[in-house]
């Protein structure tokens, strides 16, 4: 009989409910924005904004200073009285919907829903390892704005991004902002704009470069600005928007749009489709051909990545990758495939499809039918003409003005669909040693912390975490202190360590010691954690081998058996040789001898299960005695493994030595062709991993085993005679004198 | 007018060596991804390897992979593939193309592995 | 790593139209892309984004794609379009551009 072990998932080894406690924040409402900062002299805080307040915290989490913003117009608030004596617009809450560190100052900016989407400036001021904000400035000069210009109507209450840019001795304010008929015929915030801080903090500069949907398109044509970054000598926006000006506005699609961070103008302002699909390695039924699209980006960060990960994107170790999450569409409800996918798009790609893009539209001979592009931005116009117009005139540059580049840039999941279920709210890329970590928020109000590798059949976790009970979605933005990300989720904001929270979510040895060393885990007798948490005896070299099953289960007293052991950290090596006098098994009194290697019954194992096999001959020693007894496994003097090496002794109790005794055969005659069924009845008949019935030497074909009865079908006789029957287990005769007698046929 | 024009072909003995240049006039050289196919006698066309305007990703076909690099001088214009450890099945013309759309192709240069 | 298949000859008689199908996994995601290519000349574009044309190649060219077929058709075959013809499409999943497998089209 060719008995294998089972195997063991390998989410066996670890388990995603433990409870982990990471520092939190109660911020008393829905938190709106958070910000960290980070000076020189070691101090650093992290701003919290909800509706109508602003929190100052320490490192540590702990409520250093708070501020009224809002409501406007109740004498509470302080940031409406840097403004100076009112009324400065309607009253109402302050919902914050920009919060950003100006790094030249230093200072933090914020910016509100209420009083036209105005902003307000708090230099920051050390005080030892903490921050306080300095007094507001109000960045607002009533005599500088108009309903119809308004250089310091910033925020939008549908929702602005904003990244903060040093240009010389300037600080630029690339803003963008979701808007609709309302909201623009108040105001006049604009979609997209770069606007300089005047050096007086009273506000920006009059005369800013800016480009908004059109009149026209503002009903139908919604933006919605998912995130901005600054990486080399652009700022990047990432939007959600109707794929067509004039098709189905519900049909939607993810755009890059790049604008100089040298050059405060938006002449070179570029957009580019960003397309992310599933495409499944093996397609499911239902699944499209070509791969699933995931048009509708829900979250992205940018960051370089390490080694392992820029080698399968081709791409050198620490350049900078944009990472999106996209749903299928706005509702993120899931078509056949996962409900959240992740695609990498190396930031020097963008770059040269943008470019080349650019040079398509310009250069000559004329590519005929090119369209400009961004039609809600500016009249329709064909390549290399500028919008609204006919032809170039000769003092004017193709390259000048706005485009839309007219190829998509698409790439498929990276973690090939293995997401499943679980919908992505929050993302931050980390690179730690080779590895590059994506650090997931999820709708369930969970910490996912995962790898990013391409293509693998399984996901490789740091941790999969709850941060707390209330299951509330993680929300967009997170940010980075020192060596924590800052999640917010309701009210409530939790500092992760970029480790991981902890390591006692492993639940074997081997899976902890082959975690990611930037995670610190090591053993501690039976459980896995770091340094801190085992005051005894964690180590990180070694681990005892794990028996969690053998067969058989019981075997003859005399004679020999064939045991399999099953279980982990038996080799280490995928060969599963074994070098001379490394592994010791005991069962009972009785040694077992270490099999070689069947090398016809190795079966690769895929990484999603895992179990090891052992086999041994056991001849029990004279002075066993019957009964139930242990099986012990001790490993010692194995060479290390790449993470560790197996040393030590695994003890698994349930193996029973019995004597199988033979009470009665029959028929005790037959012909002499052969093939009469015997019975042969008796007590612990199957015991151990061989039996043979022997007709005068001649086996006789067993048909069936139990515990209590052996049927077999004699073979021919040579003659008409009396012969010898007899019963072998484990190769060893059954005590008992039995014949059995040929007859003619 | 766009021309691109491929040098450095030639007969090689397998395990040996060469590389191949593609200089680049009558357009922008630097916006562009650049990209080498190659033929072999009688087949169709492969695509060999890719690299954009700043050489900070590259990508290869698998048959290459760790014996072709492909660099770029965008000062001088021009696109190289190094090939090392040459096989007989390498032989072929040896095309470079201009962007994504392979919109502008050199007329090739021969190379020839044979011992 | 994808393949793209293509019918290894198409025989049409001048004045005719010829149409060459591309067949594979990623056609549907991707832009395709068709080049001709003359005995000892090297490929030309002659559609390129599924169905775009460049101005140097007559209208009688044209791209169009379903599902997962590409088909670049010629119309009025003259017996300058005897060529070989290859599609090419970017495979996201693997970073490669990939060839078709190449169709002869034989003016009869």
């Known amino acids: 009989e060719d008995w294998q072990c089972p195997r063991t998932p390998y989410a066996a080894s670890r388990d995603f409910d433990v409870k982990y406690v990471v520092p939190s924040f109660s911020a008393g409402g829905l938190v709106q924005a958070m910000v960290t900062y980070e000076g020189d002299r070691n101090e650093s805080a992290v701003f919290v904004a909800i509706r109508n307040r602003l929190h100052v915290l320490g490192p540590d989490l702990k409520s250093v200073q708070s501020l009224a913003t809002g409501p406007a117009g109740d004498p509470g608030c302080q940031t409406c009285a840097a403004c100076g004596p009112g009324p400065h617009g309607p009253p109402g809450d302050t919902d914050t919907k920009v919060l950003v560190l100006d790094p030249a100052l230093p200072a933090l900016v914020s910016c509100g829903s209420s009083l036209q989407g105005r902003c307000f400036l708090h230099d920051l001021e050390p005080q030892g390892t903490a921050v306080h904000l300095a007094a507001p400035a109000c960045l607002f000069s009533a005599h500088h704005n108009r309903p119809d210009d308004c250089p310091d109507c910033v925020a939008s209450p549908l929702g602005t991004r904003v990244t903060v840019v040093e240009q010389g001795q300037a600080s630029y304010f690339y803003v963008a902002s979701s808007l609709d008929a309302a909201v623009a015929a108040s105001f006049s915030p604009r979609s997209v704009s770069i606007r300089r801080l005047k050096a007086d903090a009273s506000g920006f500069a009059p005369g800013f470069v800016a480009l908004s949907v059109l009149p026209k398109h503002l009903v139908s044509y919604s933006i919605e600005y998912v995130h901005s970054f600054h990486t080399g000598a652009f700022v990047y926006f990432l939007t959600v928007q109707p794929a067509s000006v004039t098709d189905d506005p519900s049909a939607l699609h993810t755009r890059l749009a790049r604008l100089s961070a040298t050059e405060p103008e938006l002449g070179d302002y570029r957009e580019l489709v960003l397309d992310c699909r599933f495409a499944p390695k093996r397609r499911r039924r239902g699944a499209p051909e070509g791969g699933q699209p995931y048009p509708v980006l829900r979250v992205a960060h940018s960051a370089p990545v390490g080694a392992q990960l820029a080698t399968e994107l081709s791409i050198a170790e620490g350049q900078e990758v944009l990472f999106g999450v996209f749903v299928t569409g706005k509702d993120g409800g899931p078509g056949v495939g996962p409900n959240s996918v992740v695609c990498a798009f190396p930031i020097d790609l963008l770059d040269t499809l943008i470019d080349e893009g650019v040079e398509r539209c310009c250069e000559s001979p004329v590519h005929p039918g090119l369209r400009r592009g961004l039609d809600f931005f500016q009249s329709p116009s064909f390549c290399p003409n500028p919008p609204g117009l006919e032809a170039l005139s000769p003092n004017t540059s193709c390259r000048h003005f706005p485009l839309l580049v007219s190829s998509s840039f698409s790439r498929v999941d990276l973690f090939n669909g293995l997401l499943g279920p679980v919908q992505v709210t929050a993302l931050y890329v980390t690179r730690l040693d080779n590895v590059t970590v994506a650090h997931m928020g999820t709708m369930d109000g969970r910490i996912l912390q995962v790898e990013l590798v391409r293509s693998l059949n399984y996901l490789l976790y740091v941790s999969n975490f709850s941060l707390g009970d209330s299951g509330q979605p993680v929300q967009r933005d997170v940010s980075r202190l020192g060596d924590h990300l800052l999640f917010a989720s309701g009210d409530q904001v939790f500092q992760v360590p970029i480790q991981g929270p902890g390591c006692r979510h492993f639940l074997t040895c081997g899976r902890c010691l082959r975690a990611w060393h930037f995670m610190g885990c090591g053993w501690c007798g039976n459980m896995c954690g770091q340094q801190k948490e085992c005051p005894g005896s964690w180590q990180q070299d070694h681990c005892p081998p794990k028996l969690t099953e053998f067969h058989p289960h019981s075997g003859p007293l005399r004679g020999s058996t064939r045991l399999t052991l099953c279980g982990s950290n038996f080799y280490l090596h995928p060969s599963g040789l074994v070098p001379e006098g490394t592994h010791q098994v005991t069962v009972g009194q009785s040694p077992c001898r270490p099999l070689p290697k069947d090398s016809s019954k190795l079966r690769p194992v895929p990484r999603k299960d895992f179990v090891e096999e052992f086999e041994c001959e056991l001849e029990p020693l004279g002075t066993q005695a019957v009964g139930p007894t242990n099986v012990s496994l001790t490993v010692t003097n194995m060479p290390p493994g790449k993470h560790f090496r197996v040393d030590g002794t695994s003890v698994l109790r349930g193996f029973s030595f019995m004597e199988p005794v033979l009470i009665a055969v029959q028929p005790l005659f037959g012909p002499r062709a052969g093939g009469t069924c015997l019975t042969l009845e008796g007590q612990s008949l199957s015991v151990g991993t061989s039996r043979a019935v022997l007709v005068n030497g001649t086996e006789c074909l067993l048909a069936r085993v139990s515990e209590g009865q052996l049927l077999c079908a004699t073979p021919p006789g040579a003659t008409v005679a009396s012969v010898p029957l007899s019963l072998q287990v484990g190769g060893a005769q059954v005590p008992g004198s039995w014949t059995f007698q040929y007859r003619e046929d | 007018e766009v021309q691109l024009l491929e040098s450095g072909g030639g007969l090689v003995q397998p395990g040996g060596s060469l590389r191949l240049s593609c200089a680049a006039s009558g357009f922008t050289f630097s916006p562009y991804i650049m990209s080498w196919v190659r033929q072999a006698p009688g087949k169709g066309l492969e695509w060999v390897s890719s690299?954009?305007?700043?050489?900070?990703?590259?990508t290869y076909a698998d048959s290459v992979k760790g014996r072709f690099t492909i660099s770029r001088d965008n000062s001088k214009n021009t696109l190289y593939l190094q090939m090392n450890s040459l096989r007989a099945e390498d032989t072929a013309t040896y095309y470079c193309?201009?962007?994504?759309?392979?919109?502008?192709w050199g007329q090739g240069t021969l190379v020839t592995v044979s011992s | 790593q994808s393949v793209l298949t293509q019918t290894p000859s198409v025989s049409v008689a001048p004045g005719q139209t010829a149409r060459i199908t591309c067949e594979g996994n990623n056609i549907r995601g991707q832009s395709v892309h068709w080049y001709q290519q003359k005995p000892g000349q090297a490929p030309v574009v002659v559609v390129f984004?599924?169905?775009d044309r460049p101005s140097r190649i007559p209208e009688r060219f044209s791209g169009s794609k379903s599902g997962n077929t590409a088909t670049l058709t010629i119309i009025r075959v003259e017996a300058g379009d005897e060529a070989d013809y290859y599609c090419q499409v970017w495979d996201s999943s693997s970073d490669h551009f990939v060839f078709g497998t190449g169709t002869t089209v034989t003016v009869l």
């Open positions: 984004d599924d169905t």
């Open positions: 690299i954009v305007s700043s050489g900070g990703w590259t």
């Open positions: 193309a201009r962007g994504r759309l392979f919109d502008y």
